[in-house]
């Protein structure tokens, strides 16, 4: 037999078991389905996420945060994360089309132990494990990341979403749903099924807020909290413990009937003790107080601790670092964990892009930028330094190595350097084509000052960059403007190439340069360009464009220098040209035959409208 | 990835004005070689203009001297200026950016522009 204390005790128990319940399983779960991962629509899609033609499989990863910090740096997956299993290992195909990718069977799934917020951040990566021959195992790198804020009721259907990163699309649905006996659109009314007990012992209201009818849902109080108030009975609003008013909506400073966690009626005569250490709860992310004798004591949900459960006991195990980041945490299951973040990221999840150029790390004008693996800073010119901190001096007192000459200009200075030299004093040897600076094909050659391109047809620009028919940029149409059907199409030699190969055959010694100003000679053959005095064709020499075109006739590229009209010319016989500058020379013994002939060997030009020239173009 | 955003065609009479502009997403256009293109029904997309990242810049002929492309570094923008506007000139304009880091060409939806009395 039962003694009325001991019936006491039981009721109690009952009590605490009602309210912590929620505590020892999740009052819901966020439910997470990929549809499909793969290429997404429009130009530049890749073909597959798999490198070098090696067998890989995707899987994913989801964090969740409440309210809408879905960049927040401070904030951790507070409302938790999850790893999917690894999807069917895919290899290319080469030839095939792009498919949509193998993915992992099952949800994703992140139980939460608080109350649905209904507003929440997600983060949803997509991983990519590649399976060749690597040492040390699998390589993981990451695919795309997605990011999105949205707003969810638990319990609601499923809400479908695209997100696309980059060239990739992802395609998938969620839900948040309630787990029993937890319901509502925040999980956070407590359903009794129709055969628990009524009430909790003699006398006493119901000490938690459980609805009597599970299958049909109370409709309480128009405007009663949905937070802090809750109804057994249509049309009522009854009050958690810590709030009062007809709607629950002012917050009271006392606890409540019997049960230290038990809600408190506006309307019933509740003995009513003094404030204690637990009014207000100051438990946080749903841990429960209960009073001690010097103080309070939180009983946190599993994944978090501290003294007010205000530490994420999120661990390694559920993936919390993204972008790459490294886990870092006990061995202990219940452990913290910390994020070592890579370059680039920051936050506790290293789920924050960092954009350190909006530092302005570059003094003086320079122009930041991010390479992920460092900063770097492109100086204006006149200032040097990581950070163009070096404010350069003027070319006085300054000597340019290797034959370079100091250029002043604004109060700043450079070394023009000589052929085959760069760096701030002419003093390393540098190959200017080595960058491959030239687009499309085109060919680069070293030069006096730089380098020169030489575009392959059907391609124009300084370096090549622009197809002058980019539908069918590769092949010109059948006879290009200025050249005759049957005729050879070439690469156009830019005129700095004479100086180059004749340095390189003569030598600089045998390179007579005479520099005087005559008329056409006749055997233009046995010059490196010949000239022509009748401007009717021209070449535009430093490459800006190497298509060759009747003058006017009205379909053909040319540059936005005149060609035919020097501006200066000074009495020794050098043209000056407005950008970029054109020095050109007379060459007055034959170097070379003539560099190509046409049909029928005919001979067919480099055609310039000045006196035969080499030119070096700066 | 580099998007480009046209703006600024329309329905002008012969021998009007009219300025494109081009609105690049990349923060550094300068890295970015940029032209304009164009396209008349039924015939094949041409180079109008370009502009090389040092500055230089070539023209179609038959644009020579009535059409001037320019570009702001600190807008993210390339703008071409179409001066003394003919009939012919009717075409879809697109924007084109050459991307050297990673030798990608990138274009625009394109802008219409209609030269017509």
């Known amino acids: 037999m039962v003694s009325p204390r001991m019936s006491g005790l039981l009721s109690q128990t009952v009590i605490l078991a009602l309210i912590f319940l929620p505590q020892t399983r999740p009052a819901g779960v966020f439910e997470l389905q990929i549809h499909s991962f793969g290429p997404g629509p429009g130009p530049g899609a890749p073909r597959s996420p798999c490198s070098a033609r090696l067998p890989c499989r995707l899987f994913f990863r989801v964090c969740l945060k409440p309210g809408l910090s879905e960049e927040a740096a401070e904030s951790p997956c507070a409302l938790g994360a999850a790893l999917s299993a690894r999807g069917p290992v895919y290899t290319e195909q080469p030839g095939a089309p792009a498919p949509d990718l193998p993915l992992p069977d099952g949800l994703l799934q992140v139980p939460f132990r608080d109350a649905w917020p209904g507003t929440f951040s997600f983060i949803i990566e997509t991983w990519r494990e590649e399976l060749g021959d690597q040492i040390g195992g699998p390589a993981w790198s990451l695919l795309a990341r997605v990011a999105g804020r949205r707003r969810l009721a638990a319990g609601g259907p499923w809400a479908r979403d695209i997100q696309r990163a980059g060239a990739w699309e992802l395609r998938f649905s969620y839900r948040a749903r309630c787990e029993p006996p937890a319901v509502g659109t925040a999980c956070t009314r407590l359903c009794r099924p129709r055969s628990a007990p009524s009430r909790c012992g003699p006398g006493l209201r119901p000490c938690a807020p459980l609805e009597d009818e599970c299958e049909a849902p109370l409709v309480c109080r128009a405007g009663c909290s949905p937070e802090h108030g809750f109804c057994e009975q249509p049309g009522e609003c009854r009050c958690l413990e810590g709030w009062t008013g007809p709607l629950c909506t002012v917050p009271v400073s006392t606890s409540s009937c019997l049960s230290p966690r038990g809600p408190s009626s506006a309307t019933t005569g509740c003995l009513v003790p003094g404030p204690g250490p637990c009014d207000g709860n100051p438990c946080a992310n749903g841990g429960s107080c209960s009073e001690t004798p010097r103080s309070f004591e939180c009983t946190c949900p599993r994944g978090f601790y501290g003294l007010r459960c205000e530490v994420s006991g999120v661990t390694c195990a559920d993936g919390p670092c993204f972008n790459g980041g490294l886990c870092v945490g006990g061995a202990d299951p219940d452990s913290a964990y910390i994020c070592h973040c890579p370059p680039g990221f920051q936050g506790s999840n290293c789920e924050k892009r960092v954009d350190r150029c909006s530092l302005q790390p570059c003094r003086n004008g320079g122009l930041c930028l991010d390479l992920g693996h460092a900063l770097r800073c492109r100086c204006r010119a006149g200032f040097a330094g990581p950070r163009c901190e070096h404010d350069l001096d003027d070319c006085a007192g300054r000597a340019c190595a290797n034959g370079g000459t100091c250029v002043e200009g604004g109060g700043a200075h450079r070394c023009s350097c000589a052929l085959g030299f760069g760096g701030r004093d002419c003093r390393e040897r540098a190959d200017p084509c080595a960058a491959r600076p030239c687009a499309h094909g085109g060919r680069c050659y070293a030069h006096f000052s730089g380098l020169v391109c030489a575009c392959a047809p059907g391609y124009m620009g300084a370096r090549c960059e622009f197809p002058v028919h980019p539908d069918g940029a590769s092949a010109l149409p059948a006879a290009p403007p200025g050249l005759r059907p049957g005729d050879p199409q070439r690469y156009l030699l830019p005129p700095a190439l004479g100086l180059l190969v004749a340095a390189g055959v003569a030598g600089a010694a045998l390179l007579l340069v005479h520099v005087r100003r005559r008329g056409h000679s006749q055997d233009a053959g046995s010059r490196l360009l010949a000239g022509t005095p009748e401007p009717s064709v021209h070449a535009l020499p430093d490459a800006l464009n190497n298509l060759r075109t009747q003058e006017g006739s009205g379909d053909g590229p040319s540059s936005s220098v005149d060609w035919n009209r020097p501006e200066d010319v000074d009495p020794q016989g050098i043209y000056v040209i407005s950008a970029p500058s054109i020095y050109a020379r007379e060459v007055a013994t034959p170097l070379f035959p003539p560099l190509h002939t046409g049909r029928a060997g005919q001979r067919q030009h480099l055609l310039f409208p000045y006196p035969s020239s080499i030119l070096s173009v700066k | 990835e580099v998007q480009l955003v046209e703006s600024g065609g329309g329905l002008v009479q012969p021998g009007g004005s009219l300025t494109l502009s081009c609105a690049a997403s990349?923060?550094?256009?300068?890295?970015?070689?940029m032209a304009w293109y164009r396209q008349a029904p039924g015939k094949k997309r041409e180079l109008v203009a370009g502009i090389s990242t040092d500055g230089s810049a070539v023209y179609f002929d038959s644009v020579k001297g009535r059409f001037t492309i320019s570009r702001d570094n600190a807008k993210n923008s390339v703008y071409l200026q179409m001066n003394s506007l003919r009939a012919e000139d009717t075409a879809v304009y697109y924007c084109y950016a050459y991307n050297w880091s990673y030798a990608q060409p990138y274009w625009g939806q394109g802008t219409l522009v209609t030269v017509s009395s």
């Open positions: 990349s923060s550094s256009v300068q890295y970015l070689s």
